[in-house]
């Protein structure tokens, strides 16, 4: 899915109102020095691509994030504010249902959620090089087109 035409401000609002708090709850009890963020993103569509991948794609040692509250709210926000996103996710949802297991919070999952928090930080405030980086924030209440 190409996240270029999402309403980034609405997604950001959804993140700050609820998703961020769910991520903090998930990470509660974890030391702030425990994980080093290794996944990065360069602009908002790229950040959403990485966020989607880490949130919904099972990885070795962490297969259950998609069932967490923050994941369900992330999916809802993308479905509402990214035109055509829902249609692209039907097959992925079916596959996810087949792969369901009981929820287990592993250290690998905690590390992955720490990565997610970092990706969301960059989504909320892209740090772009100044030369030709007018797309730090676009005008409000319209779809955003980024060219990189």
């Amino acid at each position: 899915y190409d996240f270029t035409n999402c309403d980034f401000e609405k997604i950001k609002a959804a993140y700050l109102s609820t998703i961020s708090k769910d991520l903090i709850t998930y990470m509660s009890g974890t030391k702030s020095t425990e994980f080093n963020n290794t996944v990065s993103c360069s602009n908002r569509p790229h950040c959403l691509t990485e966020i989607q991948s880490l949130t919904f794609n099972p990885t070795a040692g962490c297969a259950s994030l998609a069932k967490e509250m923050f994941a369900m709210k992330t999916k809802a926000a993308l479905a509402i504010w990214c035109p055509g996103y829902s249609e692209t996710q039907i097959n992925a949802t079916q596959a996810m249902k087949k792969a369901r297991k009981s929820k287990v919070t592993t250290n690998k999952c905690l590390e992955q959620v720490s990565q997610l928090q970092g990706l969301w930080r960059r989504f909320n405030r892209p740090l772009l090089k100044q030369q030709g980086s007018s797309d730090y924030k676009d005008d409000d209440d319209k779809h955003h087109h980024h060219h990189h």
């Epitope: 401000e9 700050l16 961020s20 020095t33 963020n37 930080r121 960059r122 909320n124 740090l127």
Partner: antibody, heavy 119, light 107 residues
Amino acid sequence: EVQLVQSGAEVKKPGSSVKVSCKASGYTFSNYLIEWVRQAPGQGLEWMGVIDPGNGDTNYNENFKGRVTLTADKSTSTAYMELSSLRSEDTAVYYCAREDNTGTAFDYWGQGTTVTVSS
Amino acid sequence: DIVMTQSPDSLAVSLGERATINCKASQSVSSDVTWYQQKPGQPPKLLIYYVSNHYTGVPDRFSGSGSGTDFTLTISSLQAEDVAVYYCQQHHRFPLTFGQGTKLEIK
């Protein structure tokens, strides 16, 4: 506990440079942006720039016309702000600050470093 | 650059009364506004982020509102420890900019 500890006060001559350090502890240094803000005596706050210690990416306030350089040393969890071609108007308290967990604010601040520029 | 203009420059309010500080942006900053409190000789402290979200440990008497270009910080019942200078900041576009500050005193 998250802490940002800055280097001590400096007195500099006009035309010279100053380098202020900001040592971070209590969190993974490379995961959060470090901001630099200054405050002239009796004045308000002025954002100078930001660095991502993870990859060295920066964004500067162009009002400083290339006089500011931000760097970060991951091995010592220390960020640096260098300001060149100093003039008397650069006399100020210089603060480093960390972005918060959402990336939308500055939650932890250093104690400030007073830089005095005088001939 | 986006200019953030606070009003009033200074404000005197009686203990227990409501204090209201306004911040106007020269162009829309969506909801990307933060409020800080600064006391003499100290660095600023984060109060409110993204217009209306309380930072951890900030008392409920502090609240933020607004969107677009007009924003407000309200202290519902002024306490002695609230005497400080308050700054709004926009993080919608580089360079990030602050308001000039509002000095809050007790009447």
